[in-house]
């Protein structure tokens, strides 16, 4: 049905007929996400009329249909202004049961209505800065948080929980004030950690799940994203013991997430959100990643369970295959692995054994090849300085921040970026001493050591002197040509 | 005949192994000597790399060393404001307030009479008034059309602090200083069994013999380029833009017979300034044929290719390109905050409509 016909029907005021028209419009446009310019004015008129009715109140038996129309039109940028008003946002919030209002809603809310209005709010908040501002002013986050806290006591359908969390994600991603509010005033980390535990269906002592079902995966990912939003600019501060305990507990849940697979090939995405959040944990809380008890079949190294570190390494391997969005794909996992390696000798030694095993092939440049080491060394000259730094820093820490060792494994040419940035191009040892880790040389390396060019990091035959056979005068003449060039450049 | 060795044979084998080992050790000593040549145009960030070594390494400059830079800071500050005032004449920019013309005349008088390492309250006042003038600011905003120190705004904005009688330059102040290096500065450093000799070449034709020993057996050249130079307009006495000048030299050095097998470490410096500039000044100023977008990623990658493509021996000669931001010692601390914004943006991008 055309939007003009629906608007005309609306103006008559015959409720059932209008609902029928809306139902027909909804069926036709349920999958429309782009709209025809020709009917833009008609859609705007329809949106205005709908808003007017929305603000006056919708009949219970027609609400879902009307809200579906509003949801469809809220995908259309040209209709956003109509919907993004204080009154219509309040009306939608009331139907979603998240409005902070004086009068409580008497009867238990209709879940279908609640769900539709949540979807409308998600669309509006995602697309309209005005709606974002109004939603923040209306303090929707307060009732949303309250409801998330009720998931243990009351059963809400998966979809309602998902859209609650999605709306929380959008509000915290787009509004720093909401972020702060959820983090501080509403104790968001505790609230969402609890929600995550409930969603994963585990107590921290249990062995990790094998496969997290699809719906739980969806909800867990939303929780992880919200937690990321509210912790990334907050945990840089020193945390007290009480907070540290909470973050450690969250860490144990994230450990489960790293070890679990997600249904429906969403494992990498799920792990990605997990790793992003791990990067926000206070550094002193990362020790939980190494605190898993050893059990049958676990990977043991120096008496420590390395299952989680190994899983993170496997995740890094997978991520290094991508070329798209490289920075956000690899920086978080590299930063988590770097900090684990920096603080825990067993983790550092394990990672070094995996990533920088004793050198055997000294005939190939460190950046050439398909080993993890080669891929990481290639990133050390990446255009994006953030990518370059995380990759170089990781390898540097695996070398116990020893410049000679770093040069040995990566070559001075590749290492120069990090060394320059750290003021280490001329050697020296930074603060952050390491309990001295020994570095074993293979027989192959010892044999070839004399022929290795430290700049390229591989064996190179001594090249013939290009000036062989030249007289001193000729050499001087060539030298002066260069000097003149340098002189011109340095002026 | 069997495979058993007589006692003499065994001794001979041992001797042979020993000789091999000694030869290897001698060879190692020579091979583990790394000769680096540090090159780059003025303001390319070359000297900053050397200063940076000092700041983060060895706990930075001592107070005494910092004090010695006071005169350089003052000189840089005065030279910067003078360069702007001179350019106003050339670019036909008037002072916002006509009274500043007197200050400008006063500036030249006071600057000429200034004692090295001192800045009088009178001189500081003159500079401050001039720097605040809207015409001076307009001229500063066109600094790509004349030669101006990168650190001009840094010092001039901080004049109140710098002009204090008890002023001692900070590490960051020292890092921003600009001194014309001349001749060759040789630095030696050792990484375990690797002996490095770095020659910082500043031009100026010093004694010829000295040069030859610089150029023989160079393991790698560290070549510095200021990315932010791409939009600088030629001074009257220049034939080509400074970026093209750098490329020309890079071409000559990269393909020079002295450096046939010499790897090159290419530092594309001042990426922070470049990132800011590229939003306003298109790359086509320097490369008219450039058809990409004016985003940092695309433009920087293009410049990298322009340099790397000059290498005529791609199979035997390595170029290691590093994008750096030499004056920011803070970006040395390991932080991945830059990524968090991107993560949130992408998580939002992945949110569809319902």
């Amino acid at each position: 049905m055309e939007p003009r016909a629906v608007a005309d029907a609306l103006e008559t005021g015959e409720e059932d007929a209008v609902t029928e028209a809306l139902r027909s419009f909804n069926r036709e446009h349920s999958q429309s996400f782009t709209f025809d310019d020709a009917q833009q004015e008609d859609r705007k008129r329809l949106a205005k009329l709908l808003v007017s009715v929305l603000e006056q109140g919708l009949s219970p038996k027609h609400r879902v249909t009307w809200l579906q129309t509003i949801r469809i039109l809220s995908r259309d940028r040209s209709c956003l202004d109509s919907f993004a008003s204080r009154q219509s946002l309040h009306a939608l919030a009331c139907y979603a049961d998240i409005a902070i209002s004086e009068e409580p809603i008497p009867q238990p809310p209709d879940m279908d209505v609640l769900l539709e209005s949540l979807k409308c709010l998600c669309n509006l908040v995602l697309s309209s800065p005005t709606a974002q501002m109004l939603a923040a002013e209306a303090r929707l986050v307060v009732r949303l948080a309250e409801r998330v806290g009720l998931y243990r006591k009351r059963s809400y359908p998966h979809e309602v929980q998902f859209f609650d969390l999605r709306l929380l994600f959008l509000l915290t991603a787009l509004r720093t004030d909401v972020r702060q509010q959820l983090f501080q005033e509403l104790h968001g980390v505790r609230l969402l950690t609890d929600a995550l535990e409930l969603t994963l269906g585990v107590a921290p002592k249990e062995n990790p799940l094998v496969i997290l079902p699809a719906q739980e995966t969806e909800r867990a990912m939303e929780i992880l994203k919200v937690l990321f939003n509210i912790t990334y600019d907050s945990v840089k501060r020193e945390v007290d013991e009480e907070d540290a305990a909470l973050y450690r507990y969250l860490g144990t849940l994230l450990r489960h997430c790293v070890m679990a697979d997600a249904a429906g090939d969403r494992t990498e995405e799920f792990h990605g959100h997990t790793v992003n959040l791990l990067g926000n944990l206070p550094l002193k809380c990362l020790d939980v990643l190494l605190a898993l008890e050893l059990h049958e079949g676990s990977l043991e190294f120096m008496g420590v369970n390395m299952d989680v570190i190994n899983a993170l390494l496997a995740f890094l391997e997978k991520r290094l295959h991508q070329t798209h969005r490289l920075k956000e794909c690899v920086a978080p996992v590299l930063s988590v692995l770097t900090e684990c390696a920096r603080m825990h000798r067993p983790a550092r030694k394990f990672l070094k054994a995996q990533v920088l095993p004793p050198l055997r092939d000294v005939r190939t440049r460190p950046e050439v090849g398909d080993l993890l080491r080669n891929k990481l060394v290639r990133l050390m000259t990446h255009l994006d300085t953030d990518v370059k730094r995380v990759a170089a820093e990781f390898l540097f820490v695996l070398c116990s921040e020893s410049v000679p060792r770093f040069i040995k494994y990566t070559g001075y040419g590749n290492a120069a970026g990090l060394l320059a940035a750290r003021g280490l191009m001329a050697g020296g040892r930074p603060e952050g001493q390491y309990s001295e880790d020994e570095d074993t040389d293979t027989e192959e390396y010892r044999e070839a050591k004399a022929s290795i060019n430290p700049v390229t990091g591989r064996v190179e035959e001594k090249p013939p002197n290009p000036m062989e056979g030249m007289t001193e005068e000729q050499k001087e003449h060539e030298a002066m040509k260069l000097v003149n060039m340098f002189d011109k450049l340095s002026r | 005949m069997g495979c058993t060795l007589s006692a003499e044979d065994k001794a001979a084998v041992e001797r042979s192994k020993m000789i091999d080992r000694n030869l290897r050790e001698d060879g190692e000593k020579a091979a583990r000597e790394v000769k680096l040549l540090l090159l780059g145009a003025g303001e390319s960030g070359k000297s900053t790399i050397v200063k940076q070594m000092k700041i983060i390494h060895e706990a930075g400059y001592s107070e005494e060393e910092c004090k010695q830079y006071k005169a350089v800071v003052y000189s840089n500050t005065i030279q910067s404001i003078i360069a702007i005032i001179r350019a106003m004449g050339r670019l036909k920019i008037d002072f916002g307030d006509a009274a500043r013309a007197d200050d400008a005349r006063q500036l030249f008088v006071l600057a000429g009479a200034a004692e090295e390492g001192f800045m009088t309250a009178e001189l500081a006042g003159v500079i401050k008034r001039l720097w605040k003038d809207s015409g001076v600011q307009a001229c500063f905003n066109r600094s790509r059309e004349y030669q101006l120190n990168d650190s001009a705004a840094y010092y001039l904005n901080d004049l109140d602090r710098i002009a204090q009688p008890n002023y001692i330059p900070t590490q960051q102040d020292v890092l921003r200083t600009r001194v014309k290096t001349t001749g060759i500065v040789e630095t030696h450093f050792t990484f375990k069994d690797l002996h490095f000799k770095m020659f910082d070449v500043g031009g100026q034709r010093s004694e010829r013999k000295k040069w030859i020993h610089c150029f023989e057996g160079v393991t790698a050249i560290i070549f510095c380029v200021a990315l932010s130079d791409y939009d600088l307009v030629l001074a009257e006495d220049e034939e080509m833009n400074r970026m093209h000048e750098s490329m020309k030299l890079f071409d000559s050095i990269c393909n020079n017979k002295w450096f046939t097998d010499t790897s090159i470490i290419l530092f594309l410096n001042k990426k922070d300034l470049f990132e800011e500039k590229i939003k306003k000044s298109p790359l086509t100023i320097c490369y008219p044929e450039y058809a990409g977008s004016n985003t940092y990623e695309e433009a920087a990658a293009y410049i990298q290719c322009q340099f790397e493509d000059l290498n005529k021996r791609k199979d035997t000669k390595e170029i290691y390109t590093h994008f750096t931001c030499a004056t920011d010692t803070k970006n040395v601390q390991f932080v991945f905050d830059a990524v968090t914004d991107v993560i949130i943006k992408n998580n939002l991008k992945d949110c569809g409509l319902f």
Epitope: E11, G13, E15, S59, P60 | -
Partner: nanobody, 119 residues
């Protein structure tokens, strides 16, 4: 043809009450949303209240909230407006109308009934 006839207006003192009625004919009353609007001397038409077809959803202008109550009796094809705590600023001609919107179509609004609040 659609007919809407308002009644119940009059002169009342501030703080007093009145009950307006609107008799509908010429259409299936029970299917339509109905509204009350008013027009004060020299002013435009102002929406007062709306009620849905089943009578279970009502809404009011902020100026009358808590004092006026809209209701309907579908068996009698009649719309009501109970007005309490009347104020002088409630003085106006009150119209009943069909639908959610203050239509300018003649058949959707009655002739109106005068309400005067004065001491």
């Amino acid at each position: 043809q659609v007919q809407l006839v308002e009644s119940g207006g009059g002169l009342v003192q501030p703080g007093g009450s009145l009950r307006l009625s609107c008799a509908a004919s010429g259409f299936t009353f029970s299917r339509f949303v109905m509204n009350w609007a008013r027009q004060a001397p020299g002013k435009g038409l102002e929406w007062v209240s709306t009620i849905n077809s089943d009578g279970d959803v009502t809404s009011y202008a902020d100026s009358v909230k808590g004092r006026f109550t809209i209701s309907r009796d579908n068996a009698k094809n009649t719309l009501y407006l109970q007005m309490n705590s009347l104020k002088p600023e409630d003085t106006a001609v009150y119209y009943c109308g069909k639908g959610w919107f203050l239509n300018r179509r003649d058949e959707s609004r009655g002739q109106g009934t005068q309400v005067t609040v004065s001491s």
